[in-house]
Interface confidence: medium
Amino acid sequence: TPEVWVQVQMEATELSSFTVHCGFLGPGSISLVTVSWGGPDGAGGTKLAVLHPELGTRQWAPARQARWETQSSISLALEDSGASSPFANTTFCCKFASFPEGSWESCGSLPPSSDPGLSAPPTPVPILRAD
């Protein structure tokens, strides 16, 4: 069955910069990717970026750049303008709409004791949702 993986990493060079990586493991073509923060059921629940093969890519602050890495994975660079980093305890969710499989969503966050430049392994998080 299809799966979505999410990994969040702190950039080694800038402690206020984070990158969210998401990927879809499964057949079918990706028709839409939505990245949000706050968790699917958490507080906030705001879209950070939308990536669409036809519509193109849009992102909202504090997202800096959203881009396709492969046909089935994306990355989203985030930049914190404040002195401390609010991203450390934040859950990021990636939702992939795939034809004909449907929609799959997974969430991840920065590991609690992450060193700069390290990231969680790109394994599926057990809150996958399938249609």
Partner: antibody, heavy 120, light 107 residues
């Protein structure tokens, strides 16, 4: 205050085309996608398609491919929808609606609607 | 495409009542469910997004709940200005789809 001001009602003959407008104010047009929705008389809402005003990218409901064309004019903060080869089935009220930045993928502000009547 | 079904097409209630409107999706939409009202003059407004979150400026008497395929909108202490048609909409996939609407009338 976010507002979407749509063009006035039109009466057109079968086979003709019509182009309606949706002028955005209170926010920057290019920051949000724009949806277009059809409502036939006394019926439910049908999603036509969506446009990214930033780059003009579009995605359509399969049912409306070839029928509707979505465009934007960034300089005037206006989104447009053109309908071609009109028939009586196209008589309806058409709404533009802003795609929000909420996680729900909702449409947070709507225009007042443009009524299109197709009759010979 | 995901089909959205509002089984009740019209509903009568008295002012002050508590009213519940339901909506069912043809497949799991993972809380990506939004509610709108359409006034008799055609004006459409967002009420609830992501199943239960109140859009800014919407009175707290409106609330949403549900998960999976079944969702509901509740209006507490019904007011005259709530007389409208209510639509649900799924935001889970493209194309976006709407329920058939539930027209709320005063008894």
């Amino acid at each position: 205050e976010v507002q979407l001001q749509q063009s006035g009602p039109v009466l057109v003959k079968p086979g003709a085309s019509v182009k309606m407008s949706c002028k955005a104010s209170g926010y920057r047009l290019t920051d949000y996608y724009m949806h277009w929705v059809k409502q036939s008389h006394g019926k439910s809402l049908e999603w036509i398609g969506i446009i990214n005003p930033y780059n003009g990218g579009t995605s359509y409901n399969q049912k409306f491919k070839g029928k509707a064309t979505l465009t934007v004019d960034k300089s005037s903060s206006t989104a447009y929808m053109e309908l071609n080869s009109l028939t009586s089935d196209d008589s309806a009220v058409y709404y533009c609606a802003r795609d929000s930045s909420n996680v729900g993928n909702d449409m947070d502000y709507w225009g007042q609607g443009t009524s299109v009547s197709v009759s010979s | 495409d995901i089909q959205m079904t509002q089984t009740t097409s019209s509903l009568s209630a008295s002012l002050g009542d508590r009213v519940t409107i339901s909506c069912r999706a043809s497949q799991d939409i993972s809380n990506y469910l939004n509610w709108y009202l359409q006034k008799p003059d055609g004006t459409v407004k967002l009420l609830i997004y992501y199943s239960s979150r109140l859009h800014s400026g919407v009175p707290s008497r409106f609330s949403g709940s549900g998960s999976g395929t079944d969702y509901s909108l509740t209006i507490n202490n019904l007011e005259q200005e709530d007389i409208a048609t209510y639509f649900c909409q799924q935001g889970n996939t493209l194309p976006r789809t709407f329920g058939g609407g539930t027209k709320l009338e005063i008894r």
